[in-house]
């Protein structure tokens, strides 16, 4: 069945049941997501506007899908498996009496079950499992997923990674020669290479050992920290910088007015909320955008996405992926892919990795 092809998932509560205080609804839904994030690498965040991956809806009767609710009792809720549009959305029957306790129907317990479906789980035949098809109240203070639930969800997403990269907590300058150093984004700018990390960037002038660290805000005061992707079109003296669902255009090292703009103007579908990495190849005049385990190819001349995308990174970039942090183009034949503290020199003509390096190998570490 389908799964989310990313680990950062957004949800939005479209409307609130009058049966409960709003804060109690927020809390029940947040705790229900937490049940699943505790046993997987998934991270959930609530958004209040815009398109979320998972929309939580309270509705009665016919409500916009084929599966009309049936009044009090019977079907309590339903949820759609991962995907765009209605995919992932969880619908709760407003004709039930939703509660924080054992009376009526407990929202938290029902939400844990429905979010299981939103993440791609089917029903379980184990009566102790939260994914068992019938509702049964259990003490929410001592609630635990069953071994079957955990096995099911970890078969889809794996277990929580202890070594997951966390953002630099105090935003202090990262140690350049730390062997675990990773970058948020990397791009060439003329004969220089910019390496972005948190609120800093390092500037490396090609073939020279010296590098300097700078605050992004010192060069471009209007830009945010935490740039996530970047690419250069050298012939136009343009650099594109990405964060979340926005991008900025830098021309001749100066930010253009009327930016940021939405990444969706490139033609990404709505479910794309951020770009992991991007690189422009002047030979083909195409930009490659990497999003989770997929990539899109954009025709810079025609200003539109090439048909047939997205494609899987692992399928078309042998040895790279499934996900990357950063990439840049150099020496007319190489992409340098960054994955955590590792870097791969990739010959795009031979279509293979030609060298494996540490991410900070450019700094003479």
């Amino acid at each position: 069945g389908p799964v989310w092809r990313k680990h950062y998932i957004t949800y939005r509560i479209n409307n609130y049941t009058p049966d409960m205080n709003r804060e109690d609804v927020d809390y029940a839904i947040r705790k229900a997501f937490q049940v699943w994030s505790n046993v997987t690498p998934l991270k959930f965040s609530k958004i209040n506007t815009g398109m979320a991956d998972i929309l939580v809806v309270f509705a009665r009767g016919a409500h916009g899908d084929f599966h009309a609710f049936d009044g009090k009792g019977g079907i309590l809720a339903h949820a759609f498996g991962p995907g765009s549009g209605i995919g992932g959305d969880a619908h709760f029957d407003e004709d039930e009496f939703w509660t924080t306790h054992s009376g009526g129907t407990n929202l938290f317990l029902t939400a844990v079950h429905e979010i299981g479906h939103s993440l791609g789980l089917g029903h379980s035949s184990d009566p102790k499992a939260v994914m068992f098809p019938t509702y049964k109240y259990v003490d929410i203070n001592t609630f635990r997923l069953s071994a079957d639930d955990i096995r099911g969800i970890q078969s889809l997403y794996g277990d929580p990674k202890e070594n997951q990269r966390l953002p630099n907590p105090d935003n202090s300058e990262p140690a350049l020669c730390d062997p675990n150093l990773s970058f948020d984004a990397v791009t060439t700018v003329g004969n220089k290479i910019f390496f972005f990390k948190d609120r800093f960037f390092w500037l490396k002038v090609s073939e020279r050992p010296k590098t300097s660290v700078n605050l992004i805000s010192s060069l471009w005061p209007t830009l945010p920290s935490g740039i996530e992707a970047a690419y250069e079109i050298e012939a136009r003296n343009q650099v594109f910088l990405f964060k979340d669902d926005k991008y900025w255009l830098i021309s001749n090292l100066r930010p253009e007015p009327n930016y940021p703009k939405s990444i969706h103007s490139f033609g990404f579908p709505n479910f794309v909320k951020k770009i992991d990495a991007a690189v422009f190849n002047p030979r083909f005049y195409r930009t490659y955008f990497f999003v989770d385990n997929q990539y899109w190819r954009y025709d810079e001349r025609r200003q539109m996405m090439d048909p047939g995308y997205p494609k899987l990174i692992t399928k078309n970039f042998q040895g790279i992926g499934p996900k990357i942090d950063a990439v840049f183009y150099s020496k007319n034949k190489y992409y340098y892919f960054f994955q955590g503290s590792n870097q791969f020199e990739y010959d795009f003509l031979l279509q293979r990795i030609t060298k494996t390096l540490k991410s900070n190998s450019w700094f003479g570490c």
Epitope: L55, F66, H67, G83
Partner: antibody
Framework: EVQLLESGGGLVQPGGSLRLSCAAS????????MHWVRQAPGKGLEWVSG????????FYADSVKGRFTISRDNSKNTLYLQMNSLRAEDTAVYYC???????????????WGRGTLVTVSS | DIQMTQSPSSLSASVGDRVTITCRAN??????LNWYQQKPGKAPELLIY???SLQSGVPSRFSGSGSGTDFTLTISSLQPEDFATYYC?????FGQGTKLEIK
């Protein structure tokens, strides 16, 4: 390449029966909801019926409820529509359409067949 | 029951024009609205799903917007191949269709 090919249409008298088939290829048929949508000559689109992946869950438009039966044979990658007690107003091109989802139907039809014409006339 | 009202029912326009078609639901359908294009004698084709997501392979001159009860399909610059009939749809309910003709 996804292909849906309808067959079984033709001329039938009011009160008569007809069975439409839709042969699916180019995708794994069994996990997806499938639907029939019709279009009377010169008119708009009208959803007729839908069926879940295993065939256990079916939905019908009020206009055909009790007269039409949707079914599927996953081993043959084929969708069916059995039409009984046909009326003049059932005259239409009948399209088979693939839903984008399994488990619950989203009602989002990403692939359609070319249609088969059913004419109900005496 | 949910009903969809599409307007206008027909529309004349010229190549290069910007065209907007609207669809209204009688109750909230969130963003569960799709748009299809149908050319004479052909099956419908999916253009936009979930109100604003462009189906793969559809030109970027097509865009959709809206949520709740009011939705629009916009063609930013009409091309000769865009003259067709457009339908909005939500689950088992289609709008009446908008026939887009050459002026």
């Amino acid at each position: 390449e996804v292909q849906l090919l309808e067959s079984g249409g033709g001329l039938v008298q009011p009160g008569g029966s007809l069975r439409l088939s839709c042969a699916a290829s180019g995708f794994t048929f069994s996990p997806y909801w499938m639907h029939w949508v019709r279009q009377a000559p010169g008119k708009g689109l009208e959803w007729v019926s839908g069926i879940g992946p295993s065939g256990g869950l079916t939905f019908y438009a009020d206009s055909v409820k009790g007269r039409f039966t949707i079914s599927r044979d996953n081993s043959k990658n084929t969708l069916y529509l059995q039409m009984n007690s046909l009326r003049a107003e059932d005259t239409a091109v009948y399209y088979c359409a693939k839903d984008i989802r399994g488990a619950y139907s989203s009602g989002l039809f990403d692939y359609w067949g070319r249609g088969t014409l059913v004419t109900v006339s005496s | 029951d949910i009903q969809m009202t599409q307007s206008p029912s027909s529309l004349s326009a010229s190549v290069g024009d910007r065209v907007t078609i609207t669809c209204r639901a009688n109750q909230s359908i969130y963003t569960y609205l799709n748009w299809y294009q149908q050319k004479p004698g052909k099956a419908p084709e999916l253009l936009i799903y979930a109100a604003s997501s462009l189906q793969s392979g559809v030109p970027s001159r097509f865009s959709g917007s809206g949520s709740g009860t009011d939705f629009t399909l916009t063609i930013s610059s009409l091309q000769p191949e865009d003259f067709a009939t457009y339908y909005c749809q939500q689950a088992g309910i289609f709008g009446q269709g908008t026939k887009l003709e050459i002026k």
